[in-house]
């Protein structure tokens, strides 16, 4: 807490500029008007303030806005955002995607901090759902963002937002998350033709039920083994040898290399040996 002291003569700040970097902490406290700071927040980022000086500026804004900063200030926080605590951020009402982008830019290249997580949570709750533009923005900054959400949170993602999802955004999703995302993806891509559909739905197939895998086998998709290995075991088990053969196409030979790993291992054990033999791969049930 900075002590309240009078501003020395001639030091009263008329604007936020580089001269302030030479002010001691107590001088900043005494000589910079909080309202002036709020209106000229966009200049703060251009000035190489020390962390201690930024603490003082934050303190001034906290005093001016005890109920939480207005969006006009939040949008221009820049590096001052790094000084905010999750408790500070919970008081904010961020509605503009531009504001969100500006703050995410500050944290770019770092792991998602508790502050960023709180900011995103506030923003999404304010919007009511995770719309396409928001998802686009979030996954651009944090490819693993989608997989950090709980299945309950993912349920608020509208199917239209799924178009923004890239394969790498789903790399760390677990089966429970894909169970929620897959039906949305199926709905989002339903009007695409066979081959285009498969390209789009492929990353989500870890949430696909048996019936949909059987249906995919009718579309000449030639699923690769890497995708097949990510399918739900309970969805793969009821597939017949002929269906797996049609689903994998020329990649069916790859089953041999994966015969000891799930879901291939469990699927093999469920098949009749006579049926497995027709693949000519030497698979033993």
């Amino acid at each position: 807490e900075v002590e309240k002291t009078a501003c020395p003569s001639g030091k009263k700040a008329r604007e936020i500029d580089e001269s302030l970097i030479f002010y001691k902490k107590w001088e900043l406290e005494a000589c910079v008007d909080a309202a002036l700071l709020a209106t000229q927040m966009d200049r703060v980022n251009a000035i190489p303030f020390t962390y201690e000086q930024l603490d003082v500026l934050k303190h001034k804004l906290d005093e001016l806005y005890p109920q939480g900063y207005p969006e006009s200030v939040i949008q221009h926080l820049g590096y001052l955002f790094l000084k905010m605590s999750p408790e500070d951020i919970r008081k904010w009402n961020v509605t503009s995607l531009e504001t969100l982008k500006a703050l995410l830019e500050v944290n770019k290249g770092h792991e998602m901090s508790p502050q960023v997580a709180t900011l995103i949570d506030r923003f999404v709750k304010g919007r009511g759902q995770l719309d396409k533009d928001t998802l686009d923005t979030l996954t651009a900054f944090y490819p693993g963002y989608l997989c950090s959400l709980s299945p309950e949170e993912l349920s608020s993602v509208p199917p239209s937002s799924i178009w923004a999802v890239r394969p790498q955004d789903l790399d760390t999703c677990d089966p429970r998350q894909l169970d929620v995302l897959y039906p949305k993806a199926r709905l989002a891509f339903q009007n695409m033709n066979g081959s285009e559909y498969f390209v789009k739905i492929q990353s989500f197939l870890g949430g696909a039920p048996t019936e949909d895998l059987k249906a995919l086998s009718q579309q000449n998709v030639s699923m690769d083994l890497a995708t097949f290995m990510k399918l739900r075991t309970d969805a793969v088990l009821p597939l017949t040898v002929a269906e797996v053969q049609k689903l994998l196409g020329p990649h069916v030979e790859g089953l041999k290399a994966e015969e000891r790993h799930r879901p291939v291992r469990d699927w093999i054990l469920r098949q009749r040996q006579d049926d497995l033999d027709t693949l000519g791969l030497g698979l033993q049930g």
Epitope: P209, T240, E243
Partner: antibody
Framework: EVQLVESGGGLVQPGGSLRLSCAAS????????MSWVRQAPGKGLEWVAT????????YYPDSVKGRFTISRDNSKNTLYLQMNSLRAEDTAVYYC??????????WGQGTLVTVSS | DIQMTQSPSSLSASVGDRVTITCRAS??????LNWYQQKPGKAPKLLIY???RLHSGVPSRFSGSGSGTDFTLTISSLQPEDFATYYC?????????FGQGTKVEIK
């Protein structure tokens, strides 16, 4: 032993409707896609419709699309084919067949549908 | 749609003969080619699937070969119960289509 028994065939006027049924036994019906294949008198085989194991997906050739509807009731182990706007060229023996990936592996004995005025 | 053309349309043969039926697809169907046998007044029965795999219970005198667009069904030694009509069917691409059939008659 896989058994498929069709019923519901008969004589119907052009423009009329008919519903065929196929009772399945000897296998887990809800695990398999099912199909209808027809054969006009003295002619070859023509695939008519296929339905996914849960009933979500249906497939038809252009010749019957919009007129025929395949459906199933897994609780009754029964497959159906609703045929509307029937034409003389729909006259055929209609076979119910189990469909496995790309193979019609088991067939019923067929039911004759005659479309004539 | 993929057209399936069988030849010959019919053939006459004697018991013990080696019989060959061919089936040509209008485009590449990989190995998704099946053969069915149908006797008069009866339902078709699956004989061979995926070009050369024998369905359960089918005698080993039946065999299949080919890939891409050209396929063959061979009966190594014709038996009395083999006189029937044989159909090929492609399972590569919807709509699934059948050949027009080859009738094997007694000479």
């Amino acid at each position: 032993e896989v058994q498929l028994v069709e019923s519901g065939g008969g004589l119907v006027q052009p423009g009329g409707s008919l519903r065929l049924s196929c009772a399945a036994s000897g296998f887990t019906f809800s695990d398999y896609f099912m199909s209808w294949v027809r054969q006009a008198p003295g002619k070859g085989l023509e695939w008519v419709a296929t339905i996914s194991n849960g009933g979500t997906y249906t497939y038809y050739p252009d010749s019957v699309k919009g007129r025929f509807t395949i459906s199933r009731d897994n609780s009754k182990n029964t497959l159906y084919l609703q045929m509307n706007s029937l034409r003389a060229e729909d006259t055929a023996v209609y076979y119910c067949a189990r469909f496995d990936g790309y193979i019609f592996d088991y067939w019923g004995q067929g039911t004759l549908v005659t479309v004539s005025s | 749609d993929i057209q399936m053309t069988q030849s010959p349309s019919s053939l006459s043969a004697s018991v013990g003969d080696r019989v060959t039926i061919t089936c040509r697809a209008s485009q590449d169907i990989s190995s998704y080619l099946n053969w069915y046998q149908q006797k008069p007044g009866k339902a078709p029965k699956l004989l061979i699937y995926y070009t050369s795999r024998l369905h359960s219970g089918v005698p080993s005198r039946f065999s299949g070969s080919g890939s891409g667009t050209d396929f063959t069904l061979t009966i190594s030694s014709l038996q009395p119960e083999d006189f029937a009509t044989y159909y090929c069917q492609q399972g590569n691409t919807l709509p699934y289509t059948f050949g027009q059939g080859t009738k094997v008659e007694i000479k």
